[in-house]
Interface confidence: low
Amino acid sequence: LQVTVPDKKKVAMLFQPTVLRCHFSTSSHQPAVVQWKFKSYCQDRMGESLGMSSTRAQSLSKRNLEWDPYLDCLDSRRTVRVVASKQGSTVTLGDFYRGREITIVHDADLQIGKLMWGDSGLYYCIITTPDDLEGKNEDSVELLVLGRTGLLADLLPSFAVEIMPE
């Protein structure tokens, strides 16, 4: 089993749609279960500390350049939710996301109809197959939602930011 999220970071605009892509290949002939899981930032991207002191985060970050204070912390220190899961052709939304325009398309891509402020964070695409347990079964993408127009939005490459008409 091999799971790949092609975009490691996605920047999109508030109230606009986005698609988080996920590809997988498997030797299994059984239908795969696709699950998208959301993990909030360990600290607020806009600077306020959430769950971990920024001073501690920065000192740890200095010692280990691979450690990211925004993304790397125990799940107990941040919000973790199931966004949606798909088995066969049936898509089920997590409790927190019920009523939202969210679905799983093209086998494993997460489609969000209208982004909200709280959608910024880390999204994990997790694939489970009953008879292919070897390899990598998950990958992640960071989604950063910007509530901006003008220069900042326009300079984002089209494959990273999506600004679509209502």
Partner: antibody, heavy 131, light 108 residues
């Protein structure tokens, strides 16, 4: 080695035109937004213009709007600044600068990283507007 | 456009000392869009920090940044002779990009 080399500066009379070039090497030029920043003699830095990675979006400082045009040729790895109706106050060293990739925040690539500053600068080319 | 005001304008300190440079923005700026640069005489600027507090590649850990809203700071914990330079803060905004007027740091 990542490098930016500006050229095209010189002495020009007020009201005339000049075209600056910035040759890029050592990185995938077509993936990054590019800026022009200038510095008048003995003064601070002043941002002039920015162009998106593919040239489709351009923004200018109010002081140059309508007179300067930023453009790029990704096939030649070159950034340009066409300066028309030059004024004495345009006298400055002109730097081209590259958007920074998101160093240290994960392996993110090829997206506009205004979040991360300008990480590579040329050595500058001097423009003097004088009669 | 957002105006950035840096203080002090000039300061002179000795090697080994700690210094904090201030950058105040005319209106609230998300700290994701604040950067600091160092410029030595006759040279191009050099990126020090982005996102208000993240060090750029190759920048020693003597340099650190903090702040939010309208007040941002650059701190150099142990001054070295080579830190003598002008330091600029910079912000990205929808309306454009602006730099502060700079703080000149002299090492005695």
């Amino acid at each position: 080695e990542v490098q930016l080399v500006e050229s095209g500066g010189g002495v020009v009379q007020p009201g005339r035109s000049l075209r600056l070039s910035c040759a890029a090497s050592g990185f995938t030029f077509s993936s990054y937004g590019m800026h022009w920043v200038r510095q008048a003699p003995g003064k601070g830095l002043e941002w002039v213009a920015v162009i998106s990675y593919d040239g489709s979006n351009k923004y200018y400082a109010d002081s140059v709007k309508g007179r300067f045009t930023i453009s790029r040729d990704n096939s030649k790895n070159t950034l340009y600044l066409q300066m028309n109706s030059l004024r004495a106050e345009d006298t400055a060293v002109y730097y081209c600068a590259k958007e920074s990739p998101s160093v240290g925040l994960g392996s993110y690539y090829d997206f506009w990283s205004g979040l991360y500053g300008m990480d590579v600068w040329g050595q500058g080319t001097t423009v003097t507007v004088s009669s | 456009e957002i105006v950035l005001t840096q203080s002090p304008g000039t300061l002179s300190l000795s090697p080994g000392e700690r210094v904090t440079l201030s950058c105040r923005t005319g209106q609230r700026v998300e700290n994701l869009f604040i950067a600091w640069y160092q410029q030595k005489p006759g040279q191009a600027p050099r990126l020090l920090l982005y996102g208000a507090s993240n060090r750029a590649t190759g920048i020693p850990d003597r340099f650190s940044g903090s702040g939010s809203g309208t007040d941002f700071t650059l701190t150099i914990s142990r001054l070295e002779p080579e830190d003598s330079a002008v330091y600029y803060c910079q912000q990205y905004d929808d309306s454009g990009i602006t730099f502060g007027q700079g703080t000149r740091l002299e090492i005695k």
